[in-house]
């Protein structure tokens, strides 16, 4: 039902859903700190613009009695319960920040009259694509998929002279929320990735993955998986790997690869790591001193959600426009605003754009090195290292099908 919004007469409220089920197991206190830091910045920006208004956040906590798995599995109903709570209390703000689980976001979007914008730190799944009033501030699965297809097709680089059309995808069901939806998108038979590939098989058992590494009859040399190096080691150990195997390790929210003292372990030599361009910076910020890299990205997305709201509020107020309108609800897209860590660009569908980085392990230095970058905004790959010191023969990525090209 339609809920009146606390969003006029110089007082603008943000409803922040503090859900027990979350994309990342982050103490809610850290998210509160991020939101509060964002509010301070927004107030300063509005003041600078000569806008004498009040901006506050209301934190809506679920009771945690029923929905207490802590991960996203029971988030569908929790999101709706929180919305019901808001409705009963007549305390809807100008914007809703919070649902990070794909299940909860999808259901909330489906079951409510969304005349207000929703900002999510997460909601990675394809089912949350192309939602008119939803903004996602962490890279969704669609962006990953477009990179992979772009990279598979690339055949004009010194280190990649073959187009690929095949892949294995390792997905065993124990993944983190981001990985679950990234791999889910690759698995889906109707997805862009599946449409563009000639062969794709999902490996669900550890043994299946381990067997492929030396199987002479494998149908592809390329295996996509999601997680960190430790996850790969647990699975692969020190097993021998055929020389033309390429493992693509998707580990977007982990900037540890860029730290000066990091040495790549030997088991990473057949691996290309896909991650995001590092922020190199949040270690000293007040809300993130004690956070792991992934959780820094999560808290940062909350903070940036507040800054995005401030950005849009400022524009609308300067133009003398009403905030409680469909126009405002649909405006959180196709723009760049100043985030906490620098400019943040949202695409036509309100999804954050970023620079993805593909790393390889140098056989000379045992360091991670940047092979190429990919700008999700323009769907374009930019080679960085034209003469990589690969483990693969002739310092070129092998063909994806055994028996063709360098072995």
């Amino acid at each position: 039902s339609q809920v009146s919004q606390n969003c006029h007469n110089g007082s603008y409220e943000i409803s922040v859903l503090m859900m027990g089920n979350s994309a990342f197991a982050e103490p809610l206190k850290n998210l509160e700190d991020a939101v509060n830091e964002g509010l301070e910045i927004v107030r300063g920006r509005l003041q600078n613009a000569g806008l004498n208004v009040t901006v506050n956040a209301t934190f809506m906590y679920s009771d945690g009695l029923i929905h207490n798995s802590g991960d996203c599995r029971s988030s569908t109903c929790e999101g709706l319960d929180l919305l019901r709570k808001i409705s009963n209390a007549q305390r809807m703000g100008c914007v809703l920040i919070g649902p990070s689980c794909t299940y909860s976001t999808f259901q909330m979007y489906l079951d409510t009259e969304l005349s207000y914008p929703m900002i999510s730190a997460g909601s990675f799944g394809l089912s949350c694509d192309y939602k008119e009033t939803l903004t996602r501030l962490m890279s969704p699965a669609r962006k990953l998929m477009y990179f992979l297809v772009n990279f598979w097709k690339t055949n004009d680089l010194p280190f990649k002279t073959y187009s690929w059309s095949t892949s294995y995808v390792y997905k065993n069901g124990t993944e983190t929320e981001d990985c679950f939806w990234y791999l889910n998108a690759l698995e889906a038979s109707v997805s862009y990735f599946s449409h563009e590939l000639g062969f794709k098989v999902v490996l669900r058992q550890d043994k299946e993955f381990q067997d492929i590494l030396m199987d002479h009859n494998r149908k592809s040399n390329v295996i996509i998986m999601c997680g960190g190096p430790e996850f790969l080691y647990k699975l692969k150990g020190d097993r021998a790997v055929a020389e033309d195997i390429v493992i693509i390790l998707v580990d977007l929210f982990n900037d540890q690869y860029f730290e000066d003292n990091v040495t790549a372990p030997d088991y990473m030599k057949n691996v290309l790591v896909l991650t995001l361009s590092p922020g190199n910076s949040l270690l000293n910020s007040s809300f993130s001193r004690n956070l792991s890299p992934t959780k820094r990205d999560f808290a940062l997305a909350y903070l940036n959600g507040i800054l995005l709201f401030g950005h849009m509020l400022k524009i609308f107020l300067e133009n003398g426009e009403n905030i409680t309108t469909p126009k405002f609800a649909h405006a959180f897209r196709n723009l760049t605003f100043e985030g906490y860590d620098g400019p943040v660009t949202l695409d036509d569908w309100g999804d954050v754009d970023s620079t993805m980085v593909l790393l390889y392990t140098s056989v000379d230095t045992k360091k991670y090195k940047v092979l190429l970058t990919y700008d999700t905004h323009v769907n374009k790959t930019y080679p960085v290292d034209m003469s990589p010191t690969f483990t693969w023969k002739n310092s070129k990525l092998p063909n994806d099908i055994t028996g063709r090209g360098p072995q």
Partner: nanobody, 119 residues
Framework: EVQLVESGGGLVQPGGSLRLSCAAS????????MGWYRQAPGKQREMVAA???????EYADAVQGRFTVSRDNAKNTVYLQMNSLKPEDTAVYYC?????????????WGQGTQVTVSS
Amino acid sequence: EVQLVESGGGLVQPGGSLRLSCAASSNIFRAYGMGWYRQAPGKQREMVAAIWLSGRTEYADAVQGRFTVSRDNAKNTVYLQMNSLKPEDTAVYYCNAGPPTATSVRQYWGQGTQVTVSS
């Protein structure tokens, strides 16, 4: 009121160093990333370096590895350490909120500080 006061410029030989300072009013400093800009005679003003609220830094290709931007939150001051200076670094240097902040923020500029690199 927005106030930006740059200092530290001067005449220096090629290969030399300078450290520029910019004292900003707290309402700007605490709300935005800060950028250093420069304008050479007859040229457009260009951004040289930026430091965002988180402390993350960015540099123009021409100064990467030679210039370092930093901020002191207690003093509302942003610095630009310039090493290995070249004649083409000669310009008036300004500080202000970094892009892509609304242009309304950057309508106020300080007087700048002149940097001349010459033997």
